[in-house]
């Protein structure tokens, strides 16, 4: 679709005479008649192809024609037409004399004409307007004409529609040739795809508007490069979504079960050394002159009782100093300068003699210690108790009450909650402080894995064109993580290019 | 060919919200070159546009319904939908889906075969 | 808010040409389709682009738009082209319907 314009600029007609040679009365009131047409090697008579239109009269024998409306005529002339521009013309330019106000072809005489000229040619579609002048033996016309595209039609010959638009089905303004310049921000044929933030994942990310970044399913961050590990994941990340790999030290289906807990929580004071022994277990290892569970007892070396016989002992900087009772001497007290005949056994003890009567020795009744029987018997004094047990003297015997977790005469032994293999369907037991944990194979889950749930949504090998299935555990649903070129649920439909314009 | 599907109640209690649900088959949901409409028909007079949605979620609504109209997506499912609240008599009407094609200028090519949903009590 | 407006009925002898008009602001600088909808049936795409024809849709369709108008036109008419014929444009982001004009 596009427009022939036709530009009269100057008609000269000096002696005022029509074609005939006969001179106007008073003079040639001048109108013209302009016929369009297919391209013709000779141009001659038959139907304006391409459209006609008439002037008004616009002069009296010679006169410049006005650029602009003249007597209610249009200048240029404009010739409309709704086809693709051929490139070829013909066009003849009649001139008239016009003796009433009648300008109809039947109302005028047929010699009333003045002059007639036929041109053809090529003409190129363009804003340049192409002068041109014809001359008569007794007149002259001077004008310009050209072909430019109606309004949204572009190319060289008029035949491409477009419209520039922004809304959700394009966002675009048009080039001169007619295809689509994309405004800022948008990109794809019709221009209605937003370019997304700079670094947006291609895969994981999309967006709606320009710059944006938008995750699918199962990613996170500014640039949806980032995966989401399973709900629940406490000391853990993941490489794809919905996983769980611990960090080291940690364990369990959520990463939360504590195998380093020396590293994480430094409960040995004081120096000392910290031993794994399980899962939230650990045993310290005391430097010399400290005690309990954690080390975090400062021990005196009087509390070890040293002095024997009955000597009083003394907290020194450099460690600590016997006071003997009468009787006996040395760093201990261990020696005697006593006999049986001094009846040295206290409590019942029994004296032998040794050393050929140098010496002695008190045979102790139960529940008495010492060289001389003297003590009591503590039998917690040796810490026996393992695994921070607590222990009791009891008469004659001794007893620890164990921490929770541990048992055995010494808290030695860790009790096994997993024992009586309490998981069912082949859950793996784990022993916890405070009791036990089941670790659920697919498709069971409850506390002893004796609840039937549904199957790993993986399983079945649900995506297509070799994308990556991902369990979200917590919903019993797959995901499918799309490789380029591939979309829909399951990845099974290739995304497919849309056909050229249809211009 | 493609086809679209329009279900839901046919009856909704005034105040109440109505809900639809247009599935599509013979194509798919996700992809960038359809808008996926619904456009709606009261008995005896002409069509009216109500909104629409991409397979990303980005919706368009009637800025005359706009308060009252929610259009969702399920590229899962290959489904999507249209709930509009507080509905009165007037929006008795014949429901329709349809898919908008971009390489169509937005033109409407395939149509649901449209619901009609009465708002009385 | 966008209106687009058609007559309500146009009346056109078999084999003579119906010329249904739709007027709006500015229209020609928008994309026009035109929809025919037979009575108990969804509407059916005729005319998207201003004057494309999806395949299927007869020739004797076509369509132009310019101005503030846009006109389908149905050269031979048929009888079966009796229907209701509604225009539709997009108005920044919203879609917009004539009100439609009855062919009989």
């Known amino acids: 679709s596009g427009v022939f314009q036709l530009q009269l600029q100057e008609f000269i007609n000096e002696r005022g005479v029509l074609a005939s040679g006969r001179p106007c009365e008073p003079g040639c009131r001048t109108f013209f008649r302009v016929c369009l047409k297919h391209f013709q090697a000779v141009v001659s008579p038959g139907p304006c192809t391409f459209g006609t239109v008439s002037t008004p009269v616009l002069g009296t024998n010679s006169f410049a024609v006005r650029d602009d409306s003249s007597g209610g005529g249009r200048n240029p002339l404009q010739l409309p037409f709704n086809f693709t521009w051929p490139g070829t013309f013909s066009l003849i330019i009649e001139a008239w004399h016009a003796p009433g106000d009648d300008l109809r072809p039947e109302a005028l005489p047929p010699d009333a004409l003045i002059s007639k000229i036929a041109i053809q040619g090529s003409l190129a579609v363009g804003q340049n307007w192409l002068l041109d002048e014809q001359t008569s033996t007794l007149t002259r016309l001077r004008y310009s004409y050209r072909v430019i595209c109606s309004d949204n039609y572009y190319g060289d010959n008029c035949s491409r529609l477009c419209k520039k638009r922004n809304d959700h089905f394009g966002h675009y303004v048009c080039q001169p040739d007619g295809n689509l310049s994309c405004l800022p921000g948008w990109t794809g044929e019709y221009c209605q795809q937003p370019i997304c933030l700079s670094g947006c994942h291609e895969q994981n990310g999309y967006c709606s508007k320009p710059a944006e970044c938008l995750c699918r399913p199962g990613w996170q961050g500014r640039l949806c490069n980032e995966c989401i590990p399973h709900n629940g994941c406490r000391h853990g990340t993941c490489s794809t979504p919905w996983q769980c790999t611990c960090d080291e030290g940690w364990g369990g289906l959520f990463c939360d079960q504590d195998l380093n807990y020396c590293t994480h929580h430094s409960p040995c004071k004081n120096g000392a050394t910290c031993s794994n022994s399980g899962q939230r277990s650990y045993t310290c290892t005391c430097r010399p002159g400290y005690t309990g569970v954690d080390c975090e007892l400062e021990l005196s070396e009087c509390d070890s009782n040293p002095c024997r016989n009955g000597g009083s002992c003394k907290d020194q900087e450099d460690g600590y100093h016997c006071l003997c009772p009468p009787g006996y001497y040395g760093l201990h007290c261990e020696h005697s300068t006593l006999s049986c005949a001094d009846s040295p056994c206290f409590n019942g003890g029994s004296c032998r003699e040794r050393n050929q009567g140098a010496n002695y020795a008190c045979e102790c009744p139960p529940n008495f210690t010492g060289s001389n029987c003297e003590k009591k018997v503590d039998r917690c004094t040796s810490n026996p108790c393992a695994n921070g047990g607590q222990c009791l003297n009891r008469g004659p015997s001794r007893m620890c009450r164990c921490r929770p977790g541990f048992t055995g005469t010494y808290c030695e032994l860790h009790v096994s909650d997993c024992a009586r293999n309490p998981c069912a369907h082949g859950g793996t037991c784990h022993d916890l402080e405070n009791g036990l944990m089941c670790t659920c194979p697919a498709g069971f889950s409850g506390r002893r894995c004796e609840v039937r749930t549904s199957i790993d949504a993986c399983a079945s090998s649900p995506c297509f064109n070799r994308a990556t299935c991902y369990t979200d555990l917590s919903t019993d649903t797959f995901v499918c993580n799309c490789p380029y070129g591939f979309v829909g649920s399951r990845c099974e439909f290739p995304v497919g290019l849309p056909p050229s314009f249809p211009w | 060919e493609v086809q679209l599907q329009e279900s839901g109640p046919g009856l909704v209690k005034p105040s109440e919200t109505l809900s639809l649900t247009c599935t599509v088959s013979g194509g798919s949901i996700n992809s960038g070159n359809y808008y996926w409409g619904w456009i709606r028909q009261p008995p005896g007079k002409g069509l009216e546009w109500i909104g629409d949605i991409s397979y990303t979620g980005s919706t368009y609504y009637n800025p005359s319904l706009k308060s009252r109209v929610t259009i969702s997506v399920d590229t899962s499912k290959n489904q999507f939908s249209l709930k509009l609240s507080s509905v009165t008599a007037a929006d008795t009407a014949v429901y329709y889906c349809?898919?908008?094609?971009?390489?169509?200028?937005?033109?409407?090519?395939?149509w649901g075969q449209g619901t009609l949903v009465t708002v009385s009590s | 808010s966008y209106e687009l407006t058609q007559p309500p009925s146009v009346s056109v002898s078999p084999g003579q040409t119906a010329s249904i008009t739709c007027s709006g602001e500015?229209?020609?600088?928008?994309?026009v389709s035109w929809y025919q909808q037979k009575p108990g049936q969804s509407p059916v795409l005729v005319i998207y682009?201003?004057?494309e024809r999806p395949s299927g849709i007869p020739e004797r369709f076509s369509g132009s738009n310019s101005g503030d108008t846009a006109t389908l036109t149905i050269s031979g008419t048929q009888a079966m082209d009796e229907a209701d014929y509604y225009c539709?444009?997009?108005?920044?982001?919203?879609?917009?319907f004539g009100s439609g004009t009855k062919v009989t």
């Open positions: 349809a898919r908008e094609d971009v390489m169509y200028g937005g033109g409407g090519d395939s």
């Open positions: 682009e201003d004057s």
């Open positions: 500015g229209l020609g600088d928008k994309y």
């Open positions: 539709q444009a997009w108005d920044s982001e919203a879609g917009v």
